[in-house]
Interface confidence: low
Amino acid sequence: LRPSRGNTKRALTLKDILNGTFSYKTYFPNWISEQEYLHQSEDDNIVFYNIETRESYIILSNSTMKSVNATDYGLSPDRQFVYLESDYSKLWRYSYTATYYIYDLQNGEFVRGYELPRPIQYLCWSPVGSKLAYVYQNNIYLKQRPGDPPFQITYTGRENRIFNGIPDWVYEEEMLATKYALWWSPDGKFLAYVEFNDSDIPIIAYSYYGDGQYPRTINIPYPKAGAKNPVVRVFIVDTTYPHHVGPMEVPVPEMIASSDYYFSWLTWVSSERVCLQWLKRVQNVSVLSICDFREDWHAWECPKNQEHVEESRTGWAGGFFVSTPAFSQDATSYYKIFSDKDGYKHIHYIKDTVENAIQITSGKWEAIYIFRVTQDSLFYSSNEFEGYPGRRNIYRISIGNSPPSKKCVTCHLRKERCQYYTASFSYKAKYYALVCYGPGLPISTLHDGRTDQEIQVLEENKELENSLRNIQLPKVEIKKLKDGGLTFWYKMILPPQFDRSKKYPLLIQVYGGPCSQSVKSVFAVNWITYLASKEGIVIALVDGRGTAFQGDKFLHAVYRKLGVYEVEDQLTAVRKFIEMGFIDEERIAIWGWSYGGYVSSLALASGTGLFKCGIAVAPVSSWEYYASIYSERFMGLPTKDDNLEHYKNSTVMARAEYFRNVDYLLIHGTADDNVHFQNSAQIAKALVNAQVDFQAMWYSDQNHGISSGRSQNHLYTHMTHFLKQCFSLSD
């Protein structure tokens, strides 16, 4: 007898996960025109593609890249030069420093003379020609041509005090989500940038042990909840004559400037019109300000009638961030996503005032991102299709028509394989790439922007498909459960030979942070996939109240009371899972990282007896210990006249006694710049004071991601042992 084909398949191993054996590829064209793009080949050549002529050639060889150990590149818009980036040195989530070399494509050699200093914090080309702006030692410099001497635009930059053109820690992580804070005007005439003054911000200091006799101390200006914040100013400089009048400061709207405020984003509308967004420190009021250049005054004017106010009465403004505007061709009207009267985030068209905004999309679903507005089309993503909040499809609205007609570009392309898309558009959307993340194998495709017809597959992960053929993957289900008028979406990962009549251990993986989403129709082969495949553990992820894309009522339920409903909803879901009949009630665990570590800790300390054990990796333990912009967005201020009481009530430490009847594994990196080790140190102290036994692991010199190869291997091996012991699974 021949063994059945199914028997030849093997389960995933932890090694598979740690080695990244089953990682997938995506393909994002680096657009350089309407129909041309660059892409770095697998052997590191930079290849030029013209979709229409089907021309393709190496614009920069891997040998040139290798000659300076370059890992990234950037082509100047006039196509005469390429910057090559090497010596990448990571700083925080987005920021890094690097060494930059300029390569002259016409002469086939590196530009000599006036070489760039090192390390540079940020560098970019102008949108036209080959001007260069860069940030070095917190100051901005300009080169009219790569071989020209640099012109210094700012002189105020000071380490850990004043940042020009790059954000400080809190703005990088919680507001801009970029490594830069400078923006060229479309014609390359003006350069706008932000100056962040951190002089009065308290410093977080932690040890970095390294290899030396004495540890180093890392100092970061880091405003925790209620602390002094950065002071921000926005400037614009004329780069044609930078020496002429120097940088011009852009005025802050009066209603914003009257109290503590944030700068939230900048969008160039035209060569002499710019749009700035500002936010009150109490983040329920956002102001969008449109400013114009007055040649006669050589100044930037932001008239009051060009200020648009967005306010939330039920929570905070925007989703995770306040949305940015997508301007029409007229450079006056724009499209923007904000909550409609029913509390669902939708696209609105603003011509004069926000009050007169025309709602473009509507329904009990949410518009998520506007990709591109052209003369006749608006492309956006939403989770409308078939009512699944965890899907993303791309839609086109024909804005020339009245009423506008809507078409789903992606809904039926590869319906089973692809339900979660993003897109990358050429300049005026003549062509675009679709990147599908799942639930099947990710695939990237190229499309005609007029007909939406697929032109080419860019990456379909054939190799991954082949290597997964002999793997027993778990079955993934996305369903919803109802409880007392609330609907909770969940993802369940079931072991390969799942049998409903049997009992399985259950692991809840939780994040649960405000405006997050865990239940997404995406492909993944990760640690929990392994736990289901090899160890026979049922995994569940549940999106409780506070999570995104299901309307403001659901989202804002957690406003000013973090740590309550997120936990309650995980517990509700666990009880429902038990009712399904295939969960072993004696073997239920929960784990989470960061916000998920906070929720898993509170769930373990809920006193319900539902959980046998759990793990918290790099948890927040008190919102007073976390960043001002984040904590205050959802919790208000930790002051007596605001929300201090709930700040104190919602700590993990306050529940130390309740850990007595669970097995708790607490893990943290000592060099965590984001959720400071302080958080876990305080949990440990509270548990010791309460004489509660627990397990702990620290990772020396590791940050919030605990991402170094050795540390990550150790971490997941350690957590696996802990779980298997908890579930009485043999090694």
């Epitope: 050549n45 290849v47 697929e454 597959v457």
Partner: antibody, heavy 117, light 108 residues
Amino acid sequence: DVQLVESGGGLVQPGGSLRLSCAASGFSMSNFAMTWVRQAPGEGLEWVSGIRGSGTTYYADSVKGRFTVSRDNSKNTLYLQMNSLRAEDTAIYYCAKTWGTEYFDYWGLGTLVTVSS
Amino acid sequence: EIVLTQSPGTLSLSPGERATLSCRASQPINNYLAWYQQKPGQAPRLLIFSASNRATGIPDRFSGSGSGTEFTLTISSLEPEDFAVYYCQQYYDWPPYTFGGGTKVEIK
């Protein structure tokens, strides 16, 4: 201009071996998927083998285990090592550049392989 | 594997006439279809990709259409140099890439 030139064809006995070469100019082969397609006398086209930019190789069932595709990036040349040749392998063998991983945008003139005793 | 069936096997037409060649896939292949022209003693030449896009340098008398399982190559007005064998090829599901059996367009 893109050019592909095949060589190495000829008469070989059944069970014998042959190595075909395809020299490329006008583009760097290492960056693109390359393909071998054959055409038996008076017959249609049959895909034989392919190699991606990454070096991953693919074969038609009819040649799997007998043919090996490879590439020398420094010489910008593609190869097809053909072992255990059979009469039914008699064909003109074309080398072609693949656009992405889809269709074949540039072809060589072909080289004739005859397997006969 | 996906099987492509071309029809007719041979098409006898005069110069100036319109030629319509068909290619049917055994299962839907979206628009992942290419057409090639092969003249005697020559290598194939790419005519059409993605079912309807003309390759560089291909005269506009050649046009492709179709999606799913039914595809058509049309030559609006045959020129003497158009008499050749035409093949369709799918790249929806590979390996293997598969070709149709070919349609010979001959002078009547």
